[in-house]
């Protein structure tokens, strides 16, 4: 009997408002035993996969997706999904990444703390389970 897979969570480090040219890392979390984490951008047509999974806690695994130098084009909605054989999970909530010009003023902090929900949430759909992990190479456009 197949287990019910918990929804993944998504967060961003150091936050969700990132100065142009700075780095950001998206962190996806799911249960132990995840084979592939996928970070989707705006829609399913643009994504990145990783199988570099590590422990986040005794009951959780995580994967990290790093953008070294954020551009304006990186702004948008991101969400996570994972493959734990033999099926895909539901998507996480959306997290919105905002990219701002570096002003450096005392009243404009460089980043805002990230959260697993993110400032923008949209309902996720559950129709991703027909996909298989892109273990032989990404089948869609790269995120970055």
């Amino acid at each position: 009997q197949e287990e019910d897979l918990p929804r993944p969570s998504i967060s961003a480090e150091p936050g969700t408002v990132i100065p142009l040219g700075s780095h950001v890392t998206f962190v996806c979390r799911g249960p132990v035993g995840v084979q592939t984490f996928r970070l989707e951008r705006d829609s399913r047509s643009t994504y990145n996969d990783t199988e570099d999974v590590s422990q986040a806690s005794p009951s959780e695994s995580e994967a990290r997706f790093r953008i070294d130098s954020v551009r304006e084009g990186n702004a948008g909605l991101y969400r996570c999904i994972y493959y734990k054989p033999p099926k895909w999970s539901e998507q996480s909530d959306y997290l919105e990444l905002l990219v701002k010009e570096s002003s450096g003023g005392p009243d404009s902090p460089d980043t805002e703390p990230g959260s697993s929900a993110g400032p923008t949430q949209r309902p996720s759909d559950n129709s991703h389970n027909e996909h298989a992990p892109a273990s032989q190479g990404l089948k869609a456009e790269h995120l970055y």
Partner: antibody, heavy 117, light 107 residues
Framework: EVQLVESGGGLVKPGGSLRLSCAAS????????MNWVRQAPGKGLEWVAR??????????YYADSVKDRFTISRDDSKNTLYLQMNSLKTEDTAVYYC????????WGQGTLVTVSS | DIQMTQSPSSLSASVGDRVTITCLAS??????LAWYQQKPGKAPKLLIY???SLADGVPSRFSGSGSGTDFTLTISSLQPEDFATYYC?????????FGGGTKVEIK
């Protein structure tokens, strides 16, 4: 089909150096963490080293027994994993396996390293 | 470092027997545990990951259970090809330590 093929093993004197290679195929190498595991003759398995992906800044981890002597590295353009072994000791004699992470689901056939005078 | 204590170190069994091997972690590792089978002169083969998940192509007579510190590998009905050495390994934190192994021999 996933394949991991190790090479570079052989006979070396104590204090010497050796570089092992592992050619990977049949999977997307650059999105996987990779490991080296060794097994001394007639003994159990010992994890040696791990290297993560670009998303994790190619972070490396080592067993205490090899720290500061062995260096794990990867060349994603060549789908190849390496283990540079310096200051070799007789107790490093073992079969060395290249293993895909994080669940150690695919193993190479191993390459024998013999450290003896 | 997390120590993995595997028992028994060896056992004799007959074809058709139910075989149980246990692994004890020195601290809690959740379900970050794997089991491997190794035959002489061959590389280890993954049987179970995440304590209970069966790896691809592994017969259903193999099963894993446990969480926290106590884990079990069970072979429900031993087959001739199952005579081998079995290892557990914790994947919770580096160094990723293995148990000492259990050699399953023909009675």
């Amino acid at each position: 089909e996933v394949q991991l093929v190790e090479s570079g093993g052989g006979l070396v004197k104590p204090g010497g150096s050796l570089r092992l290679s592992c050619a990977a195929s049949g999977f997307t190498f650059n999105i996987n963490a990779m490991n080296w595991v060794r097994q001394a003759p007639g003994k159990g398995l010992e994890w040696v080293a791990r290297i993560r992906t670009k998303n994790n800044n190619f972070a490396t981890y080592y067993a205490d027994s090899v720290k500061d002597r062995f260096t794990i590295s990867r060349d994603d353009s060549k789908n190849t994993l390496y283990l540079q072994m310096n200051s070799l000791k007789t107790e490093d004699t073992a079969v060395y396996y290249c293993v895909r992470g994080p669940y150690f689901d695919y193993w190479g056939q191993g390459t024998l390293v013999t450290v003896s005078s | 470092d997390i120590q993995m204590t595997q028992s028994p170190s060896s056992l004799s069994a007959s074809v058709g027997d139910r075989v149980t091997i246990t692994c004890l972690a020195s601290q809690t590792i959740g379900t970050w545990l794997a089991w491997y089978q190794q035959k002489p002169g061959k590389a280890p083969k993954l049987l179970i990951y995440a304590a209970t998940s069966l790896a691809d192509g592994v017969p259903s007579r193999f099963s894993g259970s446990g969480s926290g510190t106590d884990f079990t590998l069970t072979i429900s009905s031993l087959q001739p090809e199952d005579f081998a050495t079995y290892y557990c390994q914790q994947l919770y934190s580096t160094p990723y330590t293995f148990g000492g192994g259990t050699k399953v021999e023909i009675k």
